[in-house]
């Protein structure tokens, strides 16, 4: 349905408040370093001139494209090559090639200064003083940290940012009612930007029939009682959404979203009973509800699906005719009746039934090579439920730290190329599977433990390929999207690593380390865990236990000590000593 | 310290069984898990089975999954293999390793002890 102007479109139908949050999003996504006053000079401009195009849709360059009007607005910015360097060559370009060219510029792992949360106090004067430039200021600081973040889900983090300061700045204790709710939006923050960026990388890097495929079995699990038609139409309309949103389609991107919401919500009858509480709420709300709803019940009594795509005679008749239909129909009944199995299962699954009917077809007779193809999902179904149950028992023997620990080791030892900033972040976040996924039944773990993994794993994949080190991340990487969580764990020890020369500046430690918060103590003694490893990776898991026991101790005893600085000096020289001595260094 | 001793290794015929043993000498063996490794001629080193420090959860390598079994007498320190069902394939040099964590991991790495190994040859 064209319109005359596209920007007088999405003004219209997102209403000015949305609109200005959405390109503000979008411009500090695409230039991550430009600051806050900057970037609302350009917003204001391009909402100013949205203006004119609802007035007048014929109006002198209201029927260019947003990627034209926003990319114009970009390449004003006069610091672009001091500050981007080769980010401005992008400016020489004509669409569609320009937007491209910003995108691939996008930096996962942007060079800004960690965000120091002021006092209570100084931030609820903030808030108060400016409301609307306190809250622009949230979504340019997550925005430019983040530039995958998913747009429309970023206005509901906005909005919810918002309750907290109207309801705790008013509080008698402010900071026992803001904190909570502050640590609670960034924790589910960082979940939500990798979430996404997974959904990104996997339609950037796999392209769109991976992405459907990934959609197909999540809405299957999701909504089982929904007809395959249903759930197609879901999962176009869902593509539609995230690719927008990967592109940088921001305006379009969050409008197609609120219309599948309308959709979904108008369609709960064919679709699920669980969605009547979403659908009474506003549109923000709304949306983020269906993405989090839980898996309605499974229908009863549904066949097996023996019949219909092994027992069958037509099973390549109906394959040759419709390929992808075919695969998606098989993915769909699989995965209605499989809530207890991972996302990357079911796809895997899926992979090897597909490589079956490719060679089965083509066989003098088909129906007997075929027929054994359900025996060869045992073992892809017995090998993320054995690693689960052993990773569980190892978080319920450890705790969470202590578990981070382990997977820092295992890490470490298969990829000791990697930086060490980016394996404590990535070791620490795979080791919160433990918390988030052990203390569910046997049912809801392999979703929760292998889908959870792939998004963490996904944080390696993009930091990584920013400045490639090892070949057997790439290779893992980008070898096959689902394959990546068991292509990481069958790694073994990199034999061909050289040891890291010993830097006894890495292992030397000083009084702040007393002063720092609890998680930030850990890191420091993750940090040295990973050079460790890294200078000995041939160090036995009880040998870096005992150098990690006697490591606590040495902070603890310093910390506690009256010269704590001379205590560090002294003491840290005896341990480094032991230490070495003990993995026979 | 803990020394790991494999016996029971030799030459078999296809379709043949074997048992092998690993004793375990200098700590207490059942804080730890135990596994079994074979390395074939010329080529890498592979899991084969492992058993928890409990012996209440058993893993296998899908190529000896229904033809071997691994099990544990922590009164004996020991553990064992039963190999039936041999097949040439199965000729390698099989090692006992022993698990600090107590699991029985599929990583060779995860390993903190190692024997010597015994060779198992199935060979008509």
């Known amino acids: 349905d064209a319109h005359k102007s596209e920007v007088a479109h999405r003004f219209k139908d997102l209403g000015e408040e949305n609109f200005k949050a959405l390109v503000l999003i979008a411009f500090a996504q695409y230039l991550q370093q430009c600051p806050f006053e900057d970037h609302v000079k350009l917003v204001n401009e391009v909402t100013e001139f949205a203006k004119t195009c609802v007035a007048d849709e014929s109006a002198e360059n209201c029927d260019k494209s947003l990627h034209t009007l926003f990319g114009d607005k970009l390449c004003t910015v006069a610091t672009l090559r001091e500050t981007y360097g080769e980010m401005a060559d992008c400016c020489a370009k004509q669409e569609p090639e320009r937007n491209e060219c910003f995108l691939q510029h996008k930096d996962d792992n942007p060079n800004l200064p960690r965000l120091v949360r002021p006092e209570v106090d100084v931030m609820c004067t903030a808030f108060h003083d400016n409301e609307e430039t306190f809250l622009k200021k949230y979504l340019y600081e997550i925005a430019r940290r983040h530039p995958y973040f998913y747009a429309p889900e970023l206005l509901f983090f906005a909005k919810r940012y918002k309750a907290a300061f109207t309801e705790c700045c008013q509080a008698a204790d402010k900071a026992a009612c803001l904190l909570p709710k502050l640590d609670e939006l960034r924790d589910e923050g960082k979940a939500s930007s990798a979430k996404q960026r997974l959904k990104c990388a996997s339609l950037q890097k796999f392209g769109e029939r991976a992405f459907k495929a990934w959609a197909v079995a999540r809405l299957s699990q999701r909504f089982p009682k929904a007809e395959f038609a249903e759930v197609s139409k879901l999962v176009t309309d869902l593509t539609k959404v995230h690719t927008e949103c990967c592109h940088g389609d921001l305006l379009e991107c969050a409008d197609d979203r609120a219309d599948l919401a309308k959709y979904i919500c108008e369609n709960q009858d064919s679709i699920s009973s669980k969605l009547k509480e979403c659908c009474e709420k506003p549109l923000l709300e709304k949306s983020h509800c269906i993405a989090e709803v839980e898996n309605d019940e499974m229908p009863a009594d549904l066949p097996s699906l023996a019949a219909d795509f092994v027992e069958s005679k037509d099973v390549c008749k109906n394959y040759a005719e419709a390929k992808d239909v075919f695969l998606g129909m098989f993915l769909y009944e699989y995965a209605r009746r499989h809530p207890d199995y991972s996302v990357v299962l079911l796809l895997r699954l899926a992979k090897t039934y597909e490589t079956t009917l490719e060679k089965c077809c083509a066989a003098a007779d088909p129906h007997e090579c075929y027929a054994k193809v359900f025996d060869e999902f045992k073992p892809l179904v017995e090998e993320p439920q054995n690693l689960i149950k052993q990773n569980c028992e190892l978080f319920e023997q450890l705790g969470e730290y202590k578990f981070q620990n382990a997977l820092l080791v295992r890490y470490t030892k298969k990829v000791p190329q990697v930086s060490t900033p980016t394996l404590v972040e990535v070791s620490r976040n795979l080791g919160k599977v433990g918390s988030k996924c052990c203390k569910h039944p046997e049912a809801k773990r392999m979703p929760c433990a292998e889908d959870y993994l792939s998004v963490v794993l996904n944080q390696l994949c993009v930091l990584h390929e920013k400045t490639p080190v090892s070949d057997r991340v790439t290779k893992c990487c980008t070898e096959s999207l689902v394959n990546r969580r068991p292509c990481f764990s069958a790694l073994e020890v990199d034999e061909t690593y050289v040891p890291k020369e010993f830097n006894a500046e890495t292992f030397t430690f000083h009084a702040d380390i007393c002063t720092l918060s609890e998680k930030e103590r850990q890191i420091k003694k993750q940090t040295a865990l990973v050079e460790l490893v890294k200078h000995k990776p041939k160090a036995t898991k009880e040998q870096l236990k005992a150098v990690m026991d006697d490591f606590a101790a040495f902070v603890e005893k310093c910390c506690k000590a009256d010269d704590k600085e001379t205590c560090f000096a002294e003491e840290g020289k005896k341990l480094v000593a032991a230490s070495q001595a003990a993995l026979g260094l | 310290q803990v020394q790991l001793v494999e016996s029971g290794g030799g030459l078999v015929q296809p379709g043949g069984s074997l048992r092998l043993s690993c004793a375990a000498s200098?700590?207490?063996?059942?804080?730890?898990?135990m596994g079994w490794f074979r390395q074939p001629p010329g080529k890498e080193r592979e899991f084969v089975a492992s058993?928890?420090?409990?012996?209440?959860?058993?893993y296998y390598a899908d190529s000896v999954k229904g033809r071997f079994t691994i099990s544990r007498d922590n009164a004996k320190n020991t553990g064992y293999l039963q190999m039936s069902s041999l097949k040439p394939e199965d000729t390698a040099v099989y090692y006992c390793?022993?698990?600090?964590?107590?699991?029985?991991?599929?990583?060779?790495?995860?390993?903190?002890?190692w024997g010597r190994g015994t060779q198992v040859t199935v060979s008509s």
């Open positions: 200098g700590r207490i063996f059942s804080t730890y898990a």
């Open positions: 390793a022993a698990d600090s964590d107590g699991i029985g991991w599929f990583n060779s790495f995860e390993y903190d002890y």
């Open positions: 058993i928890n420090r409990s012996g209440d959860s058993t």
